[in-house]
């Protein structure tokens, strides 16, 4: 696909960055847990 060709020396990109500063808050890792017998289990 010519639209996504890459020259020699460049690899296909896979990572997604937080490029816009305004997205910093919406991309902070959230810990969602389940309380089981007094212990929080991450899920």
């Amino acid at each position: 696909d010519a639209e996504f060709r890459h020259d020699s020396g460049y690899e296909v990109h896979h990572q997604k960055l937080v490029f816009f500063a305004e997205d910093v808050g919406s991309n902070k890792g959230a810990i969602i847990g389940l309380m089981v017998g007094g212990v929080v289990i991450a899920c």
Epitope: K16, F19, F20, A21, D23
Partner: antibody, heavy 112, light 112 residues
């Protein structure tokens, strides 16, 4: 792999309308701001619209304000640009961009 | 809007020699998280812009280590340690600290 694929460009008469679409894949679309950037022949990059991750905030430069509308459907992983009252000076390649990734571009030609 | 000013606008280079492009912003690009969202793109003829350096000095995946970025606050630099034939094109600096996303005018790099 992250991909952004635009569609909807073409030839339109002055005063006409077009709706561009950008199908996103390979990342969690709903977490990221998105933009439309255009490039007139032989010119530099010009932002024409920007929208935040949830679609609640948008930005337009004066050159397109009131004529262009950016929107997104996070359920469909798709970004849109509705372009009305098109002018000859809107002729350009329009790119959908997440900043780090750009689509292949779609050509919009406004001519009678 | 934040104005991005690049220099030079045209840069003839010799293969194997270093090259440097300067970018200045009209206001500080430091965000509240301590990062400067200053980026560098390369656009080759007929292609979409491609991210080279993000947040001042970080090479994007797959970008050769001959590319490096530096700077802080309002003054930034892109350096190519040894120019190769595939490095020709137009280089843009860009900021995404502030809305709207803005670009420099572009620096055209060509082989002497």
């Amino acid at each position: 792999e992250v991909q952004l694929v635009e569609s909807g460009g073409g030839l339109v008469q002055p005063g006409g309308s077009l709706r561009l679409s950008c199908a996103a894949s390979g990342f969690t679309f709903s977490r990221y701001s998105m933009s439309w950037v255009r490039q007139a022949p032989g010119k530099g990059l010009e932002l024409v619209a920007q929208i935040n991750s949830v679609g609640s905030s948008t930005y337009y430069p004066d050159t397109v304000k009131g004529r262009f509308t950016i929107s997104r459907d996070n359920a469909k992983n798709t970004l849109y640009l509705q372009m009305n009252s098109l002018r000859a000076e809107d002729t350009a390649v329009y790119y959908c961009a997440s900043g780090d990734y750009w689509g292949q571009g779609t050509l919009v030609t406004v001519s009678s | 809007d934040v104005v991005m000013t690049q220099s030079p606008l045209s840069l003839p280079v010799t293969l194997g020699q270093p090259a440097s492009i300067s970018c200045r912003s009209s206001q500080s690009l430091i965000y509240s998280d301590g990062n400067a969202y200053l980026h560098w793109f390369l656009q080759k003829p007929g292609q979409s812009p491609r991210l080279l350096i993000y947040k001042v000095s970080n090479r994007f995946s797959g970008v050769p280590d001959r590319f490096s970025g530096s700077g802080s606050g309002t003054d930034f630099t892109l350096k190519i340690s040894r120019v190769e034939a595939e490095d020709v094109g137009v280089y843009y600096c860009s900021q995404s600290t502030h809305v709207p996303w803005t670009f420099g005018q572009g620096t055209k790099v060509e082989i002497k």
